[in-house]
Amino acid sequence: GCRALEETLMDTKWVTSELAWTSHPESGWEEVSGYDEAMNPIRTYQVCNVRESSQNNWLRTGFIWRRDVQRVYVELKFTVRDCNSIPNIPGSCKETFNLFYYEADSDVASASSPFWMENPYVKVDTIAPDESFSRLDAGRVNTKVRSFGPLSKAGFYLAFQDQGACMSLISVRAFYKKCASTTAGFALFPETLTGAEPTSLVIAPGTCIPNAVEVSVPLKLYCNGDGEWMVPVGACTCATGHEPAAKESQCRPCPPGSYKAKQGEGPCLPCPPNSRTTSPAASICTCHNNFYRADSDSADSACTTVPSPPRGVISNVNETSLILEWSEPRDLGGRDDLLYNVICKKCHGAGGASACSRCDDNVEFVPRQLGLTERRVHISHLLAHTRYTFEVQAVNGVSGKSPLPPRYAAVNITTNQAAPSEVPTLRLHSSSGSSLTLSWAPPERPNGVILDYEMKYFEKSEGIASTVTSQMNSVQLDGLRPDARYVVQVRARTVAGYGQYSRPAEFETTSERGSGAQQLQEQLPL
């Protein structure tokens, strides 16, 4: 723990005038001027009534104010003469003395009160020297520290009982211990007095140091009986925009050009690419002009920008469909979430005077029109002989942050003659054991003159297709077998080629013994 603080309540070492303590009887302890080890003048008390037996000499200090202290420490410096070195003395010679104290709410003691005895005086300890000295030696100074408590009154007296020693009380110091104010875990703990017992732990509440925030509570530190801190509970940590300094006793603001996004003990970091700070204590660096962070980007990610346009858009027109392909933009803006949008515009009028407007909703984009990851799209259901402009936009996660529209590459195309659309419905006119007679409506969008129709059909059980052509919108399928199910599809042909097959329609031949009577029936797709 941290080093303990000691505060003096009384110290004879600094008293140069008479101490004038009370002694009983007067023939006992005697105040004498002397010198300490450094030859400073000091006031001491001596007693040496060793030739008479049954000694009971008391010495009492002046009143000492407690100052809210619960436990007091007493440091005694003294010398004791070795009984064996004194000739012709009775066996009552002692080499120890007793330390007492007495509590009072004011300076009430007198020459006769309290009575000179244990109880009312409270015994602290019998003090024995580590070393005693003979007459021929220099006096060997012993130092002893004792403590007592808990104290509750305004002050106290110390008392010393001699029972036949030859000794000198060189200095007496009464003091108490406290834990010094300290900083631990980015929290400040105030100076705290020790408790009443040596084993006491006194709780000191803490407060976070400036620019720190609590990370676990309660914030407390325990001050033990020796004035040392122990068992920290709770902690603070540096707030965003601040970093630890001076061995975790300070949280210093991040200098300009650096930031700290999260609270904690990490250091401030230089701003990510394309960002800056203009003031200290930044928790995020702001992006340079035309650079942005997406909502999903963390504070420690670089600022990025929008991609440049796609390159090399190539169109491959096939009648009223086309395939667009392109290459990646030269500059991805520093991101890897690139997507493409394809904007379709239908143009009217000629040359420079043409006006373009958004395409109809029925134009189909495969795999999709917006949010393409592929650099290829198939576009169909366009009008024949029509001019279109396609804009291929490059976008990324910060395109929505930019005030400017996405950058794009445009391509102009003109559609060709379209193949006819699908034949809508097939109608059964008659069936027999070996034939089916079918008719159909022409396509809704023939896109030109229909040259002929091709019919594909197969027996469902066999599954092998045959084809026939017809210049009319009806046909008789021969060579079939009775009681069999057939699937039939038709498509129209113009100079632009074949259209799509109609959806599969199903018909059944009659049994061989059946009449083959006409069964007029419109057959919608399966």
Epitope: S434, F458, S461, E462, I464, D478, P504, L526
Partner: antibody, heavy 113, light 112 residues
């Protein structure tokens, strides 16, 4: 392209039933009959029956009536053949086919205790 | 049931030569609609059967033109011109005139 996916192998106890599956893709499922054919180890081919997925019409070889039941699930484009009261004689490779032109890889059924 | 007979269980052939595989039916497979409902399949080792010829003489899609089919109402022949190693397997004839559909016992083509 047309695909008929069948599990590679199935092991079943004698007396039990087993439902073999045939998942079709790459064509309009309801436009073609599904045929089932049996081939015993080292033997020739035996036609079991056919089913029309559009209306569940079935045609069985008399020999397999009571042994095989053909069904389809249009929503998953899957045809099934349930074989009941299995014996060692039913151990064989069972093929499904789209019409007679495209065949699956077959499921090897082993009936053993 | 119509019985399909493949008299030759196996036919040995030298690669590059041609070979004919016969098949006979117990009833005429010629329908009144003009089609003969006879089909040929090849089953290569470890594989499922593959359609070669449909309605006696029509080549199925994707089948090399060295395969051809011919016959009358009850006697049929599959001819392979210039046999190749990949033609090895068992050849089955099948009738689809009546139910149940029936197969011949198969003829194994072996290279000499």
């Amino acid at each position: 392209q047309v695909q008929l996916q069948q599990p590679g192998a199935e092991l079943v106890m004698p007396g039990a039933s087993m439902k073999l599956s045939c998942k079709a893709s790459g064509y309009t499922f309801t436009s073609y009959y599904i045929h089932w054919v049996k081939q015993r180890p080292g033997q020739g081919l035996e036609w079991i029956g056919e089913i029309d997925p559009s209306d569940f019409y079935t045609n069985y070889n008399q020999k397999f009536k009571g042994k095989a039941t053909l069904t389809v699930d249009k929503s998953s484009s899957t045809a099934y053949m349930q074989l009941s009261s299995l014996t060692s004689e039913d151990s064989a490779v069972y093929y499904c086919a789209r019409g007679i032109s495209s065949w699956g890889q077959g499921t090897t059924l082993t009936v053993s205790s | 049931d119509i019985v399909m007979t493949q008299a030759a269980p196996s036919v040995p052939v030298t690669p590059g030569e041609s070979v004919s595989i016969p098949c006979r039916s117990s009833k005429s497979l010629l329908h009144s609609n003009g089609n003969t409902y006879l089909y040929w399949f090849l089953q290569r080792p470890g594989q499922s059967p593959q359609l070669l010829i449909y309605r006696m003489s029509n080549l199925a899609s994707g089948v090399p033109d060295r395969f051809s089919g011919s016959g009358s109402g009850t006697d049929f022949t599959l001819r392979i011109g210039r046999v190749e190693a990949e033609d090895v397997g068992v050849y089955y004839c099948m009738q689809h005139l009546e139910y149940p559909l029936t197969f011949g016992a198969g003829t194994k083509l072996e290279l000499k």
